[in-house]
């Protein structure tokens, strides 16, 4: 039979950050290759990463078509000899379906992790500082342009700012559902800043890691009386 000595894929894992989405699995193939299929709940299966010896498949192009859809994926284990005849032989020589393993369902809007944010700039005017978070571009498209994280999540995305005097350990925090903070500071003091992205409506993957710390007196900042 065409499926002899094939090992079904296992440990299927979605790795997704800011919608860049890769399906990973095990084991490393021996005398077999893999083909991945993806579909929406109501759609047809689409094959990707045909007859690959990799144990990952980038499915970003598919999931960014509609990040609020639910996606199903499966990994077929195809005997090496069947994979040499072209794409039409995903099914074995006797027409039987090769073994496959289903991934858990994937909802990009809910499941993609938030990437580490970056502080784009900060500007001091007197006793106020305006801190701006970089609005990271995603691979989600609308009308032929790439959308930013804010475009995709809108007010579902908030940022938490941690800030503290360079000379002190006591931190303060502020939040915004835009990409800008306007905070009060003591004149003549240098401050450090770090931000974190949060999606309040989620129950898991709610928070990003903290951004790199940026401090006043470094090149990102500007000072005006």
């Amino acid at each position: 039979s065409g499926t002899t000595n094939t090992v079904a894929a296992y440990n299927l894992t979605w790795k997704s950050t800011n919608f860049k989405t890769i399906l990973e699995w095990e084991p490393k193939p021996v005398n077999q290759v893999y083909t991945v299929q993806i579909s929406t709940k109501s759609g047809d299966w689409k094959s990707k990463c045909f007859y690959t010896t990799d144990t990952e498949c980038d499915l970003t192009d598919e999931i960014v078509k509609d990040v609020k859809q639910t996606y199903l994926a499966r990994v077929f284990s195809v005997p090496w000899r069947n994979s040499t005849h072209g794409k039409e032989t995903l099914f074995g020589t006797h027409g039987e379906e090769p073994p496959f393993t289903n991934a858990r369902k994937f909802l990009p809007y809910r499941d993609t992790k938030l990437g580490q944010p970056t502080i784009q700039s900060f500007e001091q005017v007197g006793t106020k500082v305006n801190v701006t978070v970089e609005d990271e571009r995603t691979l989600v498209r609308r009308n032929n342009t790439f959308l930013s994280l804010r475009d995709v999540f809108g007010k579902d995305l908030i940022y938490t700012l941690y800030y503290w005097k360079s000379s002190s350990s006591g931190k303060k925090t502020a939040k915004t559902n835009t990409n800008e903070f306007l905070i009060d500071v003591d004149k003549g003091e240098n401050y450090c800043f770090s931000v974190q992205a949060v999606i309040p409506s989620r129950t898991v993957n709610r928070k990003s890691t903290d951004s790199p710390v940026e401090c006043m007196g470094q090149e990102k900042g500007e000072f005006r009386e």
């Epitope: 938490t160 931190k171 939040k175 309040p200 898991v204 709610r206």
Partner: antibody, heavy 117, light 107 residues
């Protein structure tokens, strides 16, 4: 279901220390910001501070900074409030609360602390 | 630090009355304002978040309005079970601050 249960309250002498615990179930504390709030008898609510258990960041009301310390043990899914140099005016019911970033959505039942000689 | 001034500190009203409580912030809190109800011996319960959004399971007679520094909480038709103390909370920046509370009684 989501639940927060405080413990560790009681009667303590002025100048002594007390450590309160808040055991969470039904969710992972590291996914949320967690807060301590207190309420003195017959008085209003008073915010003490917060922790992001995932990275250990803590923020306090300046009036509690240095005397109170918030920490978390993610493996035990538990939040702590270490209170040092206690004073009679620290007598209150102490609540822990979960913060979804738009609101405190779950609160514990509170644990009473009495500071008295 | 942001101060929250809540008024009145107490009020008495009749069943069916429209009740209004206000909170004024010492600076713009960008709608990061919640309203909580607390009954004796119980933890606070969320009623309104982000100034105007009704929390899940909360009756529609409760509502919130406002932006900037001025916020209002309204009970459109007071019910006996609404006897409680009500607090506003700003959480736009630390230290988070509660209003002093409004104790609501029925005449």
């Amino acid at each position: 279901q989501v639940q927060l249960v405080e413990s560790g309250g009681g009667v303590v002498q002025p100048g002594r220390s007390l450590r309160l615990s808040c055991k969470a179930s039904g969710f992972n504390i590291k996914d949320y910001y967690m807060h301590w709030v207190r309420q003195a008898p017959g008085k209003g609510l008073e915010w003490i501070g917060l922790i992001d258990p995932e990275n250990g960041n803590t923020i306090y009301d300046p009036k509690f900074q240095g005397r109170f310390t918030i920490s978390a043990d993610n493996s035990k899914n538990t939040l702590f409030l270490q209170m040092d140099s206690l004073r009679p005016e620290d007598t209150a019911v102490y609540y822990c609360a979960r913060d979804n970033s738009y609101y405190f959505d779950y609160w514990g039942q509170g644990t009473p602390v009495t500071v008295s000689s | 630090d942001i101060q929250m001034t809540q008024s009145p500190s107490s009020l008495s009203a009749s069943v069916g009355d429209r009740v209004t409580i206000t909170c004024k912030a010492s600076q713009d809190i960008r709608k990061y304002l919640n309203w909580y109800q607390q009954k004796p011996g119980k933890a606070p319960k969320l009623l309104i978040y982000y100034a105007t959004s009704l929390a899940d399971g909360v009756p529609s007679r409760f509502s919130g309005s406002g932006s900037g520094t001025d916020y209002t909480f309204t009970i459109s038709s007071l019910q006996p079970e609404d006897i409680a103390t009500y607090y506003c909370l700003q959480h736009g920046e630390s230290p988070y601050t509660f209003g002093q509370g409004t104790k609501l009684e029925i005449t």
